[in-house]
Interface confidence: low
């Protein structure tokens, strides 16, 4: 058992049919040492008296709000909470695999650029009784501070009959260098609970490798005479790190037919420029990735040929 | 051990009902998408429905209204009604799990049941 | 309707050829990449191959191995062994569920 937060406790259980379980000892808060009594959530069934209370827990109803009592009197309460480990494997029921990159990725993260600011988001199908806490750090054994805002419910979808919900929550390493080479990676951990179940899940990165840059902004066309080609041209995201001689970006240019079907052609350039032929019913798109560091591309931005 | 058994397949009349049982052990419906497949004699697999970890349901469009998917966590065992019988709905009829636990519907199938042959006759 | 198009729907090959069987779907797979493999043989459940497009399952020999992204994919078996002998399947997914589909099927027999 240890301290989540004040006056909140985890037990960590082996989760198999006939587990033993753990014996736990409460203590009340308070100097009185006789007339105490002991009840769990809302029953005012007396579980025991004394200033402890000895309790075998195995399973979630045996998890809950103890509240020791004198005399009418609410002495101190102590929330325990259940983390199952299954076959040696901690549970993970309240998100959702996301399964991208990779299979067993519950939280993805990104940044828009190098000043070490980045969003975190998981996804759940869990609608309420629901808490997620977040901590980070660089490096783990002399860790070095980031600032992590309160995760909040950020969309929901539907798919099929089921709702889905994610959650983001926003970070700042507190003395980022962002031309400096990245040694030590970013440790990310959300304490994530529902109803009497913790769950931990963590993540570890460079912001290098999360980086995904904003669409290229003001995409504009302009034909070229008597021909079908036209000089597309935009500008670097004003959330790119500067300066971009520096911190360059390289482009994917794509034209794209009306039917998914149909033949895409894609010109990639350094330059913040192209000329493409624009087919009819076409849209052109540009998209952008960082120079040097085959991080993810950006999400396209598009503008009709017509 | 994961397994998964089908059971209830049998000789049926035109426009009668069926329901198909998948019994299951060594995982939790209440944690894995479960399909059903059917399979018509020398023909391909054809996805009939699925239902989710956390109970919806979807199902190919020409199911939609004849077919029925349920489920009984606490039997452990997935149920498939079927309703208004034709003779091409005579296939062998399989239960598959979800690859993942809280697998999306359409993700990868595995296990699957061994199959119970439903044969609509008059 | 979603279509998934395998071709070919018959293929006869030798022990030791490279097979490729294509699978392509007219809309999108959910994510890219929500699309699998698998084998039967006749008689018995199909097997799972390949999920998430490219990634292995479980158990099954590296000379299988899957390709493709959005609405075109490929299994390819580098070197056909006597048990490849089968019938290959692909299943999409996609954003609505209900569109879960299985391509029509590729026989696999000795030349």
């Known amino acids: 058992i240890w301290e989540l937060k004040k006056d909140v406790y985890v037990v960590e259980l082996d989760w198999y049919p006939d587990a033993p379980g753990e014996m736990v000892v409460l203590t009340c808060d308070t100097p009185e040492e006789d007339g105490i009594t002991w009840t769990l959530d809302q029953s005012s069934e007396v579980l025991g008296s004394g200033k402890t209370l000895t309790i075998q827990v195995k399973e979630f109803g045996d998890a809950g709000q103890y509240t020791c009592h004198k005399g009418g009197e609410v002495l101190s309460h102590s929330l325990l909470l259940l983390h199952k480990k299954e076959d040696g494997i901690w549970s993970t029921d309240i998100l959702k695999d996301q399964k991208e990159p990779k299979n067993k990725t519950f939280l993805r993260c990104e940044a828009k650029n190098y000043s070490g600011r980045f969003t975190c988001w998981w996804l759940t199908t869990i609608s309420t009784d629901l808490t997620f806490s977040v901590k980070s750090s660089r490096g783990s054994s002399d860790p070095q501070g980031v600032t992590c805002g309160a995760a909040t419910l950020s969309a929901e979808r539907v798919r099929g009959d089921n709702k889905e919900y994610e959650y983001s929550v926003e970070c700042q390493e507190d003395s980022a260098c962002p031309a400096a080479e990245e040694s030590l990676p970013i440790e990310v951990m959300v304490d994530a609970v529902h109803k009497l179940k913790y769950e931990n899940y963590t993540s570890s990165f460079f912001i290098r490798d999360i980086i995904k840059p904003d669409p290229p902004k003001n995409l504009q066309l302009k034909p070229l005479k008597n021909s079908r080609q036209v000089e597309v041209s935009w500008e670097y995201p004003d959330t790119w790190s500067t300066p971009h001689s520096y911190f360059s970006l390289t482009f994917c240019v794509q034209v794209q037919g009306k039917s998914k079907r149909e033949k895409k052609d894609r010109v990639f350039t350094d330059k913040t420029s192209a000329t493409v032929i624009c087919r009819k019913n076409a849209s052109i798109s540009v998209r952008a990735q960082d120079r040097y560091y085959s991080s993810s591309w950006s999400e396209w931005a598009s503008v009709p040929c017509s | 051990e994961v397994q998964l058994v089908e059971s209830g397949g049998g000789l049926v009349q035109p426009g009668g009902s069926l329901r198909l049982s998948c019994t299951v052990s060594g995982f939790s419906l209440s944690t894995y998408t479960m399909n059903w497949v059917r399979q018509a004699p020398g023909k391909g697999l054809e996805w009939v429905g699925a239902i989710s970890y956390d109970g919806g349901t979807a199902y190919a469009n020409w199911a939609k209204g004849r077919f029925t998917i349920s489920r009984d966590n606490s039997k452990n065992t997935l149920y498939l009604q079927l309703n208004s019988l034709r003779a091409e709905d005579t296939a062998v009829y399989y239960c598959a799990r979800g690859f993942y636990v809280y697998a999306y519907i359409g993700d990868a199938f595995d296990p699957w049941g061994q199959g119970t042959l439903v044969t609509v006759s008059s | 309707d979603i279509q998934l198009t395998q071709s070919p729907s018959f293929l006869s090959a030798s022990v030791g050829d490279r097979v490729t069987i294509t699978c392509q779907s007219s809309?999108?797979?959910?994510?890219?990449?929500?699309l699998s493999w698998y084998q039967q043989k006749p008689g018995k459940a199909p097997k799972l191959l390949i999920y998430l497009a490219s990634t292995l399952a479980s158990g099954v020999p590296s000379r299988f191995s899957g390709s493709g992204s959005g609405t075109e994919f490929t299994l390819t078996i580098s070197s056909l062994q006597p048990e490849d002998f089968a019938t290959y399947y692909c299943l999409g997914g996609y954003d609505d569920d209900a569109d879960t589909a299985f391509g029509g099927g590729t026989k696999v027999e000795i030349k």
């Open positions: 809309q999108t797979v959910y994510k890219n990449n929500l």
